[in-house]
């Protein structure tokens, strides 16, 4: 008999696990891209928006060649945990404008949580340490204004989009090295 219903499929092949993580990351990337576009349509953004509490982008074209699986997975998980916290904050603190995006933000949060669970599973299968974030988690303060929360939403979705984009590239490259 196979594993009990609902339990994760046990795989001895890390490449298959990585494939699964890549699929989830791609799916989340598509959702994020769509929601970011929706945000731009509904609440046009003038210029680039940044948020000090967001993680800095871990990967770039220059660093792709030197990537190691443990480092990538650990950093990706830490960064995505930060983005999850920011999405949760947006849903609660965003005001009426962002409440109109509530179904989509809720779905995005659920997908993000699912990807984090998959990464955690992958790390445990590869016997990698479940690293904690380098810095202590600082509570996210209230947006200064409604406009501030819209700017924050643009920054969060934009940053998540970039992070996921590099994550897909990095994971695919690492798969070839396994």
């Amino acid at each position: 008999p196979g594993p009990p219903a609902g339990s994760p499929r046990v795989s001895s092949d890390p490449r298959a696990d990585l494939d699964s993580a890549v699929l989830l990351t791609r799916s989340l990337l598509a959702d994020t891209r769509q929601l970011a576009a929706q945000m731009r349509d509904k609440f046009p953004a003038d210029g680039d928006h940044s948020l000090d509490s967001l993680p800095t982008l871990a990967m770039s074209a220059g660093t792709l060649g030197s990537l190691q699986l443990p480092g990538v997975l650990t950093r990706l998980r830490v960064d995505l945990m930060s983005y999850l916290r920011h999405v949760q904050w947006l849903r609660r603190a965003g005001g009426p404008s962002l409440k109109t995006l509530e179904p989509e933000l809720g779905a995005l949060q659920a997908r993000l949580e699912r990807l984090l669970r998959r990464l955690q599973l992958l790390m445990s299968r590869l016997a990698l340490p479940q690293a904690a974030p380098d810095q202590p988690v600082i509570p996210l303060g209230p947006p200064a204004s409604a406009w501030g929360s819209i700017r924050a939403a643009h920054a969060i979705l934009g940053g998540l989009h970039l992070t996921l984009d590099w994550a897909v590239r990095g994971l695919l490259l690492l798969k070839t090295r396994l």
Partner: antibody, heavy 117, light 111 residues
């Protein structure tokens, strides 16, 4: 300093209309969502409506839906509440309130609306 | 009837600690921030606690907020006569797409 001043209240007969205004000063009005909250004599607070910073998003309490309209003029730093088909149960002090997100950080002093024949 | 449930009254003597509860559901308190307002007789409400447990500048640290699941509470320690007022809890409600308030709690400072 932040100031919100409501006006336009008064005595009105059932079925008639009234328009309330809320003049805002001391902050960048166009960056904030704005709400109307009311309080019937001797009763608790009741939320009425909200309008987003740009005016594109509006939500209403079920008790006023279809009768009241919230609007704003960012060039005049003014919030409005158009109240039609007024009923006796709409009698209350109406407050405008500013919100940076999920809470009302500043309130006006209120304007009394009395619906009576 | 209010969506959020508060006790209609509470009382205490000067120096005492008083707690006011606010009960809601998963669509309001359970998934959104809780705020508390103080309304002194004949005046407009004033923000007391926001984001579940934060105090605006100028609000004494005798006032504190907390939240667990679908309930929240406001605690006032070192009760003073000037704390006699009506207290309201509030939160956004995702099902109603609007703000909901508790019915209010009238706090009386005895003696």
């Amino acid at each position: 300093q932040v100031q919100l001043v409501e006006s336009g209240g008064g005595v009105v007969q059932p079925g008639r209309s009234l328009r309330l205004s809320c003049a805002a000063s001391g902050f960048t009005f166009s960056h904030y969502d704005m709400h109307w909250v009311r309080q019937a004599p001797g009763k608790g607070l009741e939320w009425v409506a909200v309008i987003s910073y740009s005016g594109s998003v509006k939500f209403y309490a079920d008790s006023v839906k279809g009768r009241f309209t919230i609007s704003r003029d960012n060039s005049k730093n003014t919030l409005y509440l158009q109240m039609n088909s007024l009923r006796a149960e709409d009698t209350a002090v109406y407050y405008c309130a500013r919100t940076p997100g999920s809470h009302f950080d500043y309130w006006g002093q209120g304007t009394l609306v009395t619906v009576s024949s | 009837q209010s969506v959020l449930t508060q006790p209609p009254s509470a009382s205490g003597t000067p120096g005492q600690r008083v707690t006011i509860s606010c009960s809601g559901s998963s669509s309001n308190i359970g998934s959104n921030y809780v705020n508390w307002y103080q309304q002194l007789p004949g005046t407009a409400p004033k923000l007391l606690i926001y984001y579940d447990d934060l105090r605006p500048s100028g609000v004494p640290d005798r006032f504190s907020g907390s939240k667990s699941g679908t309930s929240a509470s406001l605690a006032i320690s070192g009760l003073r006569s000037e704390d006699e007022a009506d207290y309201y809890c509030s939160a956004w409600d995702d099902s109603l797409s609007g703000v909901v308030f508790g019915g209010g709690t009238k706090l009386t400072v005895l003696g």
